[in-house]
Amino acid sequence: EDELQVIQPEKSVSVAAGESATLRCAMTSLIPVGPIMWFRGAGAGRELIYNQKEGHFPRVTTVSELTKRNNLDFSISISNITPADAGTYYCVKFRKGSPDDVEFKSGAGTELSVRAKPS
């Protein structure tokens, strides 16, 4: 069985301020089981944008229905983009662990740039 891969097909996305940004991510397998998370930035200071498991992320919606048992699409849409949202976004697969889930594999990242709102 091939090992799971995290695919972020776009290296960069450009969005006008005030619009929504869609960041695409797909898995090649459901195994190992564990949640998907999205982060802005890398390393210790990265910012959690979305956690499949828990939390309230009012600006984030998932493109696909994550409650489907066979879902492999973990793309998200972030509403009302501002210049402060610019950065590189990573889709990260965790495998289950105790007490904490363990980072398993990350996508290559998608750089979000924000254009000035058209006048």
Partner: antibody, heavy 118, light 107 residues
Framework: DLQLVESGGGVVRPGESLRLSCAAS????????MSWVRQAPGKGLEWLAG????????YYIDSVKGRFTISRDNSKNSLYLQMNSLTAEDTAVYYC???????????WGLGTLVTVSS | ALTQPASVSANPGETVKIICSGG??????YGWYQQKSPGSAPVTVI????KRPSDIPSRFSGSASGSAATLTITGVRVEDEAVYFC???????????FGAGTTLTVL
């Protein structure tokens, strides 16, 4: 308070049909996958079917595939189980259950009893 | 199939462990469900291997390792007497399964 209330159980003859309902309240029903689980007298729990939050995807245990149909109406906060060609082996208490993000169960209804007898 | 002992017993205050085996660690999540009488509504005491719902006492804990999951009740009480079912979700088959149940008797 979160509540799941099943209804529609009763006594039917072999070969007949029954439709169970589960009324949900106290949470955003349309955001959660749901399942039906049953328990035959003196037996353990048996998962029967699950349905995604939007209702587009359904999943069944082999023994009920083709006979039972799970569905939902998010506008009515309701889950359903249509059961056809019932046999004595379908006699059980039927529970609806809310699924967690990873398809386990966090909340259960009180159950409704289905008796199939001639 | 999930395998768990048919019965366990303990004195009040003791620690009880119920082991459920039969799943593959990398494709399976486990839960534990308490049923105080036949036909009564099950109550989830553990989901996602080790997550305890907020209304469940802290004496209940769960863990998973290899092909087994364990429910631990630390300082068991008389009101914990019940049948405990382990359950599993398999990400390969999309199917939920349950063990046959373990009857806990508090002496």
């Amino acid at each position: 308070d979160l509540q799941l209330v099943e209804s529609g159980g009763g006594v039917v003859r072999p070969g007949e049909s029954l439709r169970l309902s589960c009324a949900a309240s106290g949470f955003t029903f349309s955001s959660y996958a749901m399942s039906w689980v049953r328990q035959a007298p003196g037996k353990g729990l048996e998962w029967l079917a699950g349905i995604s939050a939007g209702g587009s995807d359904t999943y069944y245990i082999d023994s009920v595939k083709g006979r039972f149909t799970i569905s939902r109406d998010n506008s009515k906060n309701s889950l359903y189980l249509q059961m056809n060609s019932l046999t004595a082996e379908d006699t059980a208490v039927y529970y609806c259950a809310r699924e967690t993000w990873n398809h386990l169960f966090d909340y259960w209804g009180l159950g409704t009893l289905v008796t199939v007898s001639s | 199939a999930l395998t768990q002992p048919a019965s366990v017993s303990a004195n009040p205050g003791e620690t009880v462990k119920i082991i459920c085996s039969g799943g593959d660690y990398y494709s399976t999540y486990y839960g534990w469900y308490q049923q105080k009488s036949p036909g009564s509504a099950p109550v989830t005491v553990i989901h996602s291997d080790d997550k305890r719902p907020s209304d469940i006492p802290s004496r209940f804990s769960g863990s998973a390792s290899g092909s087994a999951a364990t429910l631990t009740i630390t300082g068991v009480r008389v009101e914990d007497e019940a049948v405990y079912f382990c359950g599993a979700y398999d990400g390969r088959t999309y199917i939920n399964t349950f063990g046959a149940g373990t009857t806990l008797t508090v002496l």
